[in-house]
């Protein structure tokens, strides 16, 4: 029987800068029941607070609701593991909520084959940003990535769209059915999951771009 091993806070995520959750990985339990507590203080403060919500994020997590979340302030947090034989502390983790946003996937993905008379045909892809993200304030810059592949292909073709919410693709295989998905990330944050796939049938008379 031993004191607990050192825990590690290994991930923090926010869907929208208004709330966030951090998760830790326990160290060894020393063969005894072990209690974990997360304490934190904000940059420039000395007053320590305990995690406000150990439930919402699941096991080994701390959730910070709206009233506990402030942007532009660094949170300095650590986890304490305690059993009958003693305690151990994680390294301190410095967290700025502005940098840990992982948005929901983009919405309303629409895909269409365009065949203008005077130009080469192309695949036109359009989407909307996720609803929880407020782009109007300028606090967010969302970057987008598209992936597509013929239905039976193994490899995805990836296109970086920057801040655009629409994109044209010229080189496609005629007669094939394609899957198209889009995802987004803040300029300093994490990629969303891919949106649900949209399927599009490429006409057999679609002319490949040179």
């Amino acid at each position: 029987q031993l004191p607990p091993g050192k825990p590690e806070i290994f991930k923090c995520r926010s869907p929208n800068k208004e709330t966030f959750t951090c998760w830790w990985r326990p160290g060894t339990d020393g063969g005894l029941p072990t209690n974990y507590s997360l304490t934190y203080h904000r940059e420039g403060e000395t007053l320590m607070h305990e995690c406000p919500d150990y439930i919402t994020g699941g096991p080994n997590s701390c959730h910070f609701g709206k009233q506990y979340t402030s942007m532009w302030r660094t949170y300095i947090m650590m986890v304490n593991a305690t059993n009958q034989m003693g305690s151990s502390f994680s390294d301190e983790l410095y967290v700025d909520v502005t940098y840990i946003v992982q948005p929901d996937p983009p919405l309303e993905l629409a895909v269409e084959v365009k065949q203008p008379e005077d130009r080469k045909p192309y695949l036109w892809i359009k989407w909307s940003p996720p609803t929880l993200i407020d782009l109007k304030t300028g606090w967010f810059t969302l970057l987008y990535e598209i992936r597509l592949k013929p239905e039976k292909a193994a490899e995805w073709e990836i296109h970086f769209a920057g801040q655009q919410t629409e994109f044209k693709i010229l080189s496609l295989h005629p007669g094939q059915k394609y899957l198209v998905q889009v995802r987004c990330k803040p300029d300093h944050g994490y990629w969303s999951a891919w949106s649900p796939a949209t399927f599009i049938q490429i006409p057999s008379d679609f002319t490949m771009n040179d």
């Epitope: 590690e8 991930k11 923090c12 990985r25 660094t74 390294d91 700025d96 940098y99 990330k185 990629w191």
Partner: antibody, heavy 120, light 107 residues
């Protein structure tokens, strides 16, 4: 404890490439951005670029954009910096540096440095 | 790119002295400034982040202040182990840039 261990010194010819490695231990590699900073002999520090090891998303200093490639191998917790088309002014100590937290780019842990000498 | 201009480039001081190093940014950077200490042949070591926050384990004799474009690192009572070169760094906008360094030498 957190450690960043870099590969050994290199001597390279002008026009060639160098790839420096930085093996991380003592923390979860994918949690923090990793940066590369260089220092020419007797000179100051110059930021080259950064990578998020969780998804290999990277940003570069435009000064090096066409010559530098930063990669990360999650399976070995190792970051790499490759600099191509080497010239004598690329002679420097190259450091990897871990982001201080989940936040802006200040650097709390540094590798020991790798001296790259470019000479014909 | 944002230029970070440090002054002085070197300073001679004695143990116990108060030393002040300044850093001026060419554009507004808010409080997105860090300070590092570097000894010969070693990697830099973080002292201050967000202009005024001491990093874990950094002695209280080191303090940082300033916002906007003008920043200061102060060593309140210089110790023998503080003789080194000090760098400021901005992380407000890409590319992240460092000052030219200030060498603190023994008088």
């Amino acid at each position: 404890q957190v450690q960043l261990v870099q590969s050994g010194a290199e001597v390279k010819k002008p026009g060639s490439s160098v790839k420096v490695s930085c093996k991380a231990s003592g923390y979860t590699f994918t949690t923090y951005w990793m940066h590369w900073v260089r220092q020419a002999p007797g000179q100051g520090l110059e930021w080259m670029g950064e990578i998020d090891p969780s998804d290999s998303y990277s940003n570069y200093n435009q000064k090096f954009k066409d010559r530098v490639t930063i990669t990360a191998d999650k399976s070995t917790s190792t970051a790499y910096m490759e600099l191509s088309s080497l010239r004598s002014e690329d002679t420097a100590v190259y450091y990897c540096a871990r982001n201080g937290g989940l936040g802006p780019a200040w650097f709390s842990y540094w590798g020991q440095g790798t001296l790259v000498t470019v000479s014909s | 790119d944002i230029q970070m201009t440090q002054s002085p480039s070197s300073v001679s001081a004695s143990v116990g002295d108060r030393v002040t190093i300044t850093c001026k940014a060419s554009q507004y950077v808010g409080t997105a400034v860090a300070w590092y200490q570097q000894k010969p042949g070693k990697a830099p070591k973080l002292l201050i982040y967000s202009a005024s926050n001491r990093y874990t384990g950094v002695p209280s004799r080191f303090s940082g202040s300033g916002s906007g474009t003008d920043f200061t690192l102060t060593i309140s009572s210089l110790q023998p182990e503080d003789f080194a070169t000090y760098y400021c760094q901005q992380y407000s906008s890409y590319p992240w840039t460092f000052g030219g360094g200030t060498k603190v030498e023994i008088k």
